[in-house]
């Protein structure tokens, strides 16, 4: 048995930050689980990890330098990514693993979410400012 995952096909990070919600066909509340977000078609970069155990506080971390936070819902984990760079525009995949109680479970690979990072466009000061008003 595999858990099914739903993600938005595309998200735009206008202010270098984005909320990516991973929706699962599975209730995580009474489970020890590891939810992770992976970057790239080959999922080579583990962007963020949310580790949950029903009796303890959620642990959220990134070992790859991403600024991330995570929030647990009944059947979802939302990853909040901040300080994204334009060159981090890519496809991102949600992964879920249920560690306990046994048996171990994971998900069917999802379709992923393309995160398009649009950098902050600071308005440049005009080269020839017009006459100042009195």
């Amino acid at each position: 048995n595999k858990i099914l995952v739903k993600q938005s096909p595309m998200l735009v990070a206008y202010d270098n930050a984005v909320n990516l919600s991973c929706k699962y066909s599975y209730n995580l509340f009474s489970r020890e689980f590891r939810a992770s977000l992976h970057k790239g078609l080959d999922s080579a970069v583990e962007v963020c990890v949310v580790y949950g155990n029903y009796s303890q506080q959620l642990q959220v971390y990134s070992k790859t330098g991403f600024n991330c936070d995570g929030k647990l819902g009944n059947e979802s984990v939302t990853f909040y990514l901040q300080n994204l760079y334009v060159n981090q525009t890519d496809i991102y995949f949600c992964k879920i693993e249920v560690m306990y109680p046994p048996p171990y479970l994971d998900n069917e690979k999802s379709n992923g979410t393309i995160i398009h990072v649009k950098g902050k466009h600071l308005c440049p000061s005009p080269l020839f400012p017009g006459p100042s008003k009195p």
């Epitope: 599975y26 995580l28 509340f29 009474s30 489970r31 009944n74 059947e75 109680p101 046994p102 048996p103």
Partner: antibody, heavy 120, light 107 residues
């Protein structure tokens, strides 16, 4: 899915007994088996569970030292040994299979129960 | 450990009536609760899982409700075959405690 339990046992105080629960109709190593006690005139009491896939075990603290859960994968059988028997251990013991309903647990399949009578 | 308080301990009702059995826990179990029926000399039978989901083949006169720490099993239009013992059980960690049981008798 079937859980076939061993027959009734009449045992003396202080003795031990081993009950069996033979599973069929599914992949034995993929499901947790729970054990439950039912004393006459009382309610159901959870003893513990055994996972044959990795030999993981969880006991109710009340039954630690009283019950020992093991399994034989070749015969798809889970065993529960009860030691140091007293009249308090006289009861019907059930095994039941835990199913995972998308993250919610329940026990949909039960054995027929084994009656253990402790008497001198 | 989670404490399960089931009430009432016994009920004497007539065929056709409606009954409600409740189960209270000392902490939130997030709907990780099952209800069972057990008849004399038989194995328990699962009726409801995840607090509200009816098991396939169980008559629709049985229904489960509740969340957090308070859960109920309702049986409408009681039939003669509904008499017996009823138990709730939580699955929020271990031990997976049962409620004390409710004995449903014919009046």
């Amino acid at each position: 899915v079937q859980l076939q339990q061993s027959g009734a046992e009449l045992v003396k105080p202080g003795a031990s007994v081993r009950l069996s629960c033979k599973a069929s109709g599914y992949t034995f190593t993929e499901y947790i088996i729970h054990w439950i006690k039912l004393r006459s005139g009382q309610g159901l009491e959870w003893i513990g569970w055994f996972y044959p896939g990795s030999n993981d075990i969880q006991y109710n603290a009340k039954f630690k030292g009283k019950a020992t859960l093991t399994a034989d994968k070749s015969s798809s059988t889970v065993y529960m040994e009860l030691t140091g028997l007293t009249s308090e251990d006289s009861a019907v013991y059930f095994c039941a299979r835990r199913d995972d309903f998308s993250g919610y647990d329940a026990l949909p399949y039960w054995g027929q129960g084994t009656l253990v009578t402790v008497s001198a | 450990d989670i404490q399960m308080t089931q009430s009432p301990a016994s009920l004497s009702v007539s065929v056709g009536e409606t009954v409600t059995i409740t189960c209270r826990t000392n902490e939130n179990i997030y709907s990780n609760l099952a209800w069972y029926q057990q008849k004399q000399g038989k194995s328990p039978q699962l009726l409801i899982y995840a607090a509200t989901h009816l098991v396939e083949g169980v008559p629709s006169r049985f229904s489960g409700s509740g969340s957090g720490t308070q859960y109920s099993l309702k049986i409408t239009s009681l039939q003669s075959e509904d008499f017996g013992n009823y138990y709730c059980q939580h699955f929020w960690g271990t031990p997976c405690t049962f409620g004390g049981g409710t004995k449903l008798e014919i009046k």
